[in-house]
Interface confidence: medium
Amino acid sequence: KKVVLGKKGDTVELTCTASQKKSIQFHWKNSNQIKILGNQGSFLTKGPSKLNDRADSRRSLWDQGNFPLIIKNLKIEDSDTYICEVEDQKEEVQLLVFGLTANSDTHLLQGQSLTLTLESPPGSSPSVQCRSPRGKNIQGGKTLSVSQLELQDSGTWTCTVLQNQKKVEFKIDIVVLAFQKASSIVYKKEGEQVEFSFPLAFTVEKLTGSGELWWQAERASSSKSWITFDLKNKEVSVKRVTQDPKLQMGKKLPLHLTLPQALPQYAGSGNLTLALEAKTGKLHQEVNLVVMRATQLQKNLTCEVWGPTSPKLMLSLKLENKEAKVSKREKAVWVLNPEAGMWQCLLSDSGQVLLESNIKVLPTWSTPVQP
């Protein structure tokens, strides 16, 4: 018996070939001996089977002795043994129809689980293997689960169903709803305007939801909601914004926030959450702000940074075009009785300067100037 695998919703063509290369009498039946279709001369006749409207043949092939059964919009329950009767002989074809569907939706939030469920006919024992867009292979039986979806899991998943040494391939497009970056860090001198951007890693026709930016300032004991907003068809509207600091938000995607000025009391970490309509859970992006201040008070030149800096970052004070006077893996450095000239405060990571602030030290009878 020949075995053919089909995909739910697809069209399958079961072949039946006579030894004579001419149009002769044939008919297709199912395992219950109910006639599906056949011919009467050059006419196609259909029987009372449940396939009725979905069954067809190719009249153009009859003259060559080929009498195929075409079944459109396959259903799992179409799985059966189909019998072609022609020239006093019977050809049997076993059709097994499989379906593979994602648990709820193909648009899933980062961190959520993807469950693929295989629909299969009774009595079958298929195995499934899926390959993710990043090349990860997952094997399973009737259900296949991937926990903690990542951004790289967005794209086409290719799943192969194996049964009786035959295989059928499914392609499922999965969209992982996430921000392009899980975390970002902004370095600013005190007083500078700060731009935060939260680009999404996906595009959809309509995007509706609501979001909020919570901020944990380094100096504060608790976090504070800085802004709440709504998203309707990719249009952003601010619902509420704190009075201090007063963030401004762009009206279009990507989500864009402007902090009027970087201040030590704002330095810290924020968490932007976005709840999308008809989705359980939220998208998250962490954003960090590091603020630098260089000051001269009496005979002490000080450079400080506030915010989440890693222990490997180096803070240095140096006179322009000279070696660093002081460099420490700390959040404050100072020089007593600094020489007159343009001093630079540098925050660097493995030699790469992340933030720089200049302060002009005048001869002792003058007051300092900050450019």
Partner: antibody, heavy 118, light 111 residues
Framework: QVQLVQSGAEVKKPGASVKVSCKAS????????IHWVRQATGQGLEWIGE????????YSNSKFKDRVTITADKSTNTAYMELRSLRSDDTAVYFC???????????WGQGTLVTVSS | DIVLTQSPASLAVSLGQRATITCKAG??????????MNWYQQKPGQPPKLLIY???NLESGIPARFSGSGSGTDFTLNIHPVEENDAATYYC?????????FGQGTKLEIK
């Protein structure tokens, strides 16, 4: 201690402009927002707008949007509020103010009386 | 804009008694457990003086005779016991949403 000292009284003709100053002392000027509020004689208080002195970002009440400009000079720790196309109903005392640790205005300037009269 | 309506417009209270001023906001000024309502006292020829912030927090240096309460849209300033020095105009102000707005004021007279 925190102090906000404003410029003196002004008399202006309708259609003219006025620029009121507010000099801050006793704290780091760039650390706090300066707000401007006005009060017509015997009337209530009306918020005009605000400025972040560090970056110069300013926001104002849409009622004054086209006529008001709020600026700050970090070198002199001074904030300015300029109101153009003056009308007689702009006659009021103009205050600058700063927040305390909470959300209210804990520090106020002494006020500047602006009289608009032909 | 959020409209704040104070009542009464004026009131006269005997020395040592309680003065109660209410402020009704056109929409809720609550967020995340806090009510963004402040109260000020103003005497003629002087700038306003902050008494209460975030509905019920007493500004430093303000006597405990002053207290604030309320949430959502309804707020109250209580002064008890009233002293002669309390004669002034009192304003509520919301710092929930731009533009910041003030109530029209309540004039307190001491009998």
């Amino acid at each position: 201690q925190v102090q906000l000292v404003q410029s003196g009284a002004e008399v202006k003709k309708p259609g003219a402009s006025v620029k009121v100053s507010c000099k801050a002392s006793g704290y780091t000027f760039t650390d706090y927002v300066i707000h401007w509020v006005r009060q017509a004689t015997g009337q209530g208080l009306e918020w005009i707008g605000e400025i972040y002195p560090g970056s110069g970002s300013a926001y104002s009440n849409s009622k004054f949007k086209d006529r008001v400009t709020i600026t700050a000079d970090k070198s002199t720790n001074t904030a300015y509020m300029e109101l153009r196309s003056l009308r007689s109903d702009d006659t009021a005392v103009y205050f600058c103010a700063r927040r305390g640790n909470g959300t209210g205005f804990a520090y106020w300037g002494q006020g500047t009386l602006v009289t608009v009269s032909s | 804009d959020i409209v704040l309506t104070q009542s009464p417009a004026s009131l006269a209270v005997s020395l040592g008694q309680r003065a109660t001023i209410t402020c009704k906001a056109g929409q809720s000024v609550d967020y995340d457990g806090d009510s963004y309502m402040n109260w000020y006292q103003q005497k003629p020829g002087q700038p306003p003086k902050l008494l209460i912030y975030v509905a019920s927090n007493l500004e430093s240096g303000i006597p405990a005779r002053f207290s604030g309460s309320g949430s959502g849209t309804d707020f109250t300033l209580n002064i008890h016991p009233v002293e002669e020095n309390d004669a002034a105009t009192y304003y509520c102000q919301q710092s929930y949403k731009d533009p910041l707005t003030f109530g029209q004021g309540t004039k307190l007279e001491i009998k």
